[in-house]
């Protein structure tokens, strides 16, 4: 078993908006969950978009969640990881 | 004083319809999560829905999708709960009970008195 | 869902006795994602221990949490009268959200 690496970026989206993406990478296996939360609740299927999860070319595997929500209320969004039994969370840059 | 009333109980029957209501005051309504939990008369407490402070997720247990709509009015500060096919089983006292966060921890942390809702012929 | 069940459901306890009550879950729950609540009867429920091991502001050190996976545990070093409620597990590790069937504890 490797474990991911997870990094969190923002991006501006649109006015008062701003995209987050959650990137998971060089796991193996292949079986990861990877869901944003807001307020410690795990936000609804259809205000997340996934990517597929992909080869990186050296035996582990990559994937993405991403997000959009509003600036200034990061603090209320982390990144939920969850992979071979083991998990973490990770927060929104400021 | 953060304060939670529910109203909206009373006396249903089996089949009918009932819609509570949940009035907040004493803190900003409108950034605050809320659910609904029911408890049966001398049961445990069961979780109902849960409606995030912007209206963005809604979750619902298994026992009442399909039937139970949860809502909210922001500027009035209120909390809506509509229950349809109302059965026998749904007979319970109804609380709504805010979602604190806090230092990254999120937890009930004010509850409401509770409003008694009973579906019988 | 994720099923909660609590043992024993009920239990009688002496003054001054170690007690310990168990939360099993039917499917892995983050530790950071189970709570325990204390109810006495005509009240709400309290947020007694959180994240699993935290104890709640107010909350007497004589109690204590541990577990991970599907099996939590909430022990009272040494009971006192006060401590007569009913204890329920929480979780919110995945939706829907579910509380525990609860543990009674009485005065022996």
């Known amino acids: 078993t490797v474990p991911p690496m997870v990094n969190v970026t923002r991006s501006e989206a649109s006015e008062g908006n701003i995209t987050v993406t959650c990137r998971a990478s060089g796991f193996y296996p292949w079986n990861i969950t990877l869901s944003w939360r807001q307020d410690g609740v795990s936000l609804s299927h259809d205000t997340q978009q996934w990517g597929d999860v992909l080869p990186d070319g050296n035996g582990t595997y990559q994937t993405w969640v991403a997000t959009r929500i509003c600036q200034g209320e990061e603090q209320r969004f982390t990144c939920y990881m969850e992979h071979s039994g083991n998990h973490s969370t990770h927060p929104v840059p400021s | 004083d953060v304060q939670l009333v529910e109203s909206g109980g009373g006396l249903v029957q089996p089949g009918g319809s009932r819609k509570l209501s949940c009035a907040a005051s004493g803190f900003t309504f409108s950034t605050f999560g809320i659910h609904w939990v029911r408890q049966a008369p001398e049961k445990g407490l069961e979780w109902v829905a849960y409606?995030?402070?912007?209206?963005?997720?809604?979750y619902y247990a298994d026992t009442v999708k399909g039937r139970f709509t949860i809502s909210r009015d922001n500027p009035k500060n209120t909390l809506f709960l509509q229950m349809t096919s109302l059965r026998s089983e749904d007979t319970a006292m109804y609380y709504c009970a805010r979602w604190a966060y806090e230092g990254g921890v999120n937890y009930f942390d004010n509850w409401g008195q509770g409003t008694t809702l009973t579906v019988s012929s | 869902q994720i099923v909660l069940t609590q043992s024993p459901a009920i239990m009688s306890a002496s003054l001054g006795e170690r007690v310990t009550m168990t939360c099993t879950a039917t499917?892995?729950?983050?530790?950071?994602?189970l709570h325990w609540y204390q109810q006495k009867p005509g009240s709400s429920p309290k947020l007694w221990i959180y994240?699993?091991?935290n104890l709640a502001s107010g909350v007497p050190a004589r109690f204590s949490g541990s577990g991970s996976g599907t099996s939590y545990s909430l022990t009272i070093g040494s009971m006192e009268a006060e401590d007569a409620a009913t204890y329920y597990c929480?979780?919110?590790?995945?939706?829907?959200?579910?509380f525990g069937t609860g543990t009674k504890v009485e005065i022996k």
């Open positions: 994240s699993s091991s």
């Open positions: 499917s892995g729950v983050s530790s950071s994602y």
């Open positions: 409606i995030s402070y912007d209206s963005r997720t809604i």
């Open positions: 929480h979780q919110f590790h995945r939706s829907p959200l579910t």
